[in-house]
Each structure stands twice: as C-alpha cells, then as structure tokens.
C-alpha cells in the first residue's frame, strides 16, 4: 500500500467565487474516497467535479475533486480523503 499525497489549491473563478481543487497523487491501490465536506457534512454530488483515477506512470495513481465556493467561506470546507483504511482532512489554504 502506498498512501496518497494530498494537496489543496485555490484559483480565482467568477467574481466573489473561487475554485478549490483537492488532488491526491502517488497512491496504490487505486480505490480511494476523495470528496469535499461543507459545514462538516457531505457536499452534494452535483456541486463537485471529479477527475478520473488515472495511472501516473510510476505504478501508482492520481485523481482530483473540485468545487466552487464563495470567497471568505473557505473555513467551512474541507477535503476528505480515505484510502486503505486511513483517512485525512485537508483545509483550503488561506
């Protein structure tokens, strides 16, 4: 088992909004849960965009999930990752 490296980034979207992206990379096996939580509960499926789980060329895998949020509300969002029985949560950087 190779645990993922998780990285959260932000980019400007439309006025007053930002897109936050949570990337998991270099993990094996390929089964992974990667999702955004808002206010501690699941963000609806429709509010998130997922990338495919793809090989990264080193025998491991990578994927991502993104959502658009209002600037100033970053604290309310965390990226949740679960892989091979381990889990972690990742805040949006300031």
């Amino acid at each position: 088992t190779v645990p993922p490296m998780v990285n959260v980034t932000r980019s400007e979207a439309s006025e007053g909004n930002i897109t936050v992206t949570c990337r998991a990379s270099s993990f094996y096996p390929r089964n992974i849960i990667l999702t955004w939580r808002q206010d501690g509960v699941s963000l609806s499926h429709d509010a998130q965009q997922w990338g495919d789980v793809l090989p990264d060329g080193n025998g491991t895998y990578q994927t991502w999930v993104a959502t658009r949020i209002c600037r100033g509300e970053e604290q309310r969002f965390t990226c949740y990752m679960e892989h091979s029985g381990n889990h972690s949560t990742h805040p949006v950087p300031s």
Epitope: D39, Q75, Y80
Partner: antibody, heavy 119, light 107 residues
Framework: DVQLQESGPGLVKPSQSLSLTCTVT?????????WNWIRQFPRNKLEWMGY???????NYNPSLKSRISITRDTSKNQFFLQLISVTTEDTATYYC????????????WGQGTLVTVSA | DIQMTQSPASLSASVGETVTITCRAS??????LAWYQQKQGKSPQLLVY???MLADGVPSRFSASGSGTQYSLKINSLQPEDFGSYYC?????????FGAGTKVEIK
C-alpha cells in the same frame, strides 16, 4: 481545551419561551467551528437542534425551524438558544456542543441543563 | 431525513464478554457516522468518528466497522466502566440524527 457550560431557567411554563446560554471558554467562538444545541428527551432520545457558526451563520433542524433561534454575544463568548411556544414535549436536558469542519461529530459537550415545561 | 435504527435497544452482559451494537441508516451515509457513550447523569462522550476511527483516549477494546447503511460497534472483553448507553449519529446531511440508543447493563 474547549469547555462549554449551559445555563438558564430550569422551569418554563407552556406557551412561553425557553432561553438558554452556552458559555465557551478556551476558544473564541468567532475563530472557527459550528456551535450547536442538542437536546435529550426524558426517554433518552437525542435531537440535534441547530448551530451558529464562527461567522454567525445559522442552520436549524427543520422540525424546529418555526420556533428556534440561535444567536450569540461575541464579546462574552456566549451563544444562546431561544425556543418559542414551548409545550410539555420540550421538556428535556439541553446540551451545547461544537464540531469542527472536518466532520459534524461532537467531540465535547457541556454538562447539560434540565428544562421542565410545566404549568 | 435519514433515520438511524439501533439494535438491540438493551442488552445484559458480563464483564469479559464481547458485545456488538448495530446501527442501520435509512439511506447510504457513506461512513459519515459517529458513536457516543453516555453514563447515567453524564454528557455523551465521543467514541468513534468516520465510522471506524477511535477518538483520542478510547481504549483499543472498542472497534467499529461498516459501510453503506449498516454499521456496528464492538466491545471486546467488556469492562465495568463500559456499562452505559451507546448512540450512533450520522453526519451525511442535515438534519443530523441519532439512533435511539442501546443500553448495556451488567448481567
């Protein structure tokens, strides 16, 4: 460590309003987290009532939405529960608690305060 | 709303026994589940979050498992301090709801 302490009247008459205070020590309620009220009925059923978060945004249980209000006094690091038009069915132990945004579970609770609704 | 159904409502067990409590959600809650222990006259205390993760300070005789709609809490070698009531709680969506509880009593 975050500590929470509920206070308020232990007896309220039917049709009146129930008002409770949660005093938080060890953490500023404007820094982070969602600050919640939960109640436990005499037969031990637990009910999440709602929260006010660090920025003042509220979220209520739809079963209570027409009767509940959660507010705060940031200068005293307190948040409040008001429940209007109470009946005997609102007799319960009322707890304040909080959760972090990594998941809506409750790591610490106040000691609880029993409120009896009776004429 | 997601309803949480706990079973059994109560059980009697002896010190040293293994007990299992189950919690069924009315919809898939995707491991968004917590377990609490409550002693008589005290506040609930967090035992488990994210369905399987033990909270800080919880003894390793407690374990939890499950997925989808079915979850369980297992206590190996029951100790005198484990007697009390146990509640599950989902946090998949609002409103947050709790199970009705399981009371673990001394046989």
């Amino acid at each position: 460590d975050v500590q929470l302490q509920e206070s308020g009247p232990g007896l309220v008459k039917p049709s009146q309003s129930l008002s409770l205070t949660c005093t938080v020590t060890g953490y500023s309620i404007t820094s982070d987290y969602a600050w919640n009220w939960i109640r436990q009925f005499p037969r031990n059923k637990l009910e999440w009532m709602g929260y006010i978060n660090y920025s003042g945004t509220t979220n209520y249980n739809p079963s209570l939405k027409s009767r509940i209000s959660i507010t705060r006094d940031t200068s005293k690091n307190q948040f409040f529960l008001q429940l209007i038009s109470v009946t005997t069915e609102d007799t319960a132990t009322y707890y304040c608690s909080y959760y972090r945004y990594d998941g809506a579970w409750f790591p610490y609770w106040g000691q609880g305060t029993l409120v009896t609704v009776s004429a | 709303d997601i309803q949480m159904t706990q079973s059994p409502a109560s059980l009697s067990a002896s010190v040293g026994e293994t007990v299992t409590i189950t919690c069924r959600a009315s919809g898939n809650i995707h491991n968004y589940l917590a377990w609490y222990q409550q002693k008589q006259g005290k506040s609930p205390q967090l035992l488990v979050y994210n369905a399987i993760m033990l909270a800080d300070g919880v003894p390793s005789r407690f374990s939890a498992s499950g997925s989808g709609t079915q979850y369980s809490l297992k206590i190996n070698s029951l100790q005198p301090e484990d007697f009390g009531s146990y509640y599950c709680q989902h946090f998949w969506s609002f409103p947050l709801t709790f199970g009705a509880g399981t009371k673990v009593e001394i046989k």
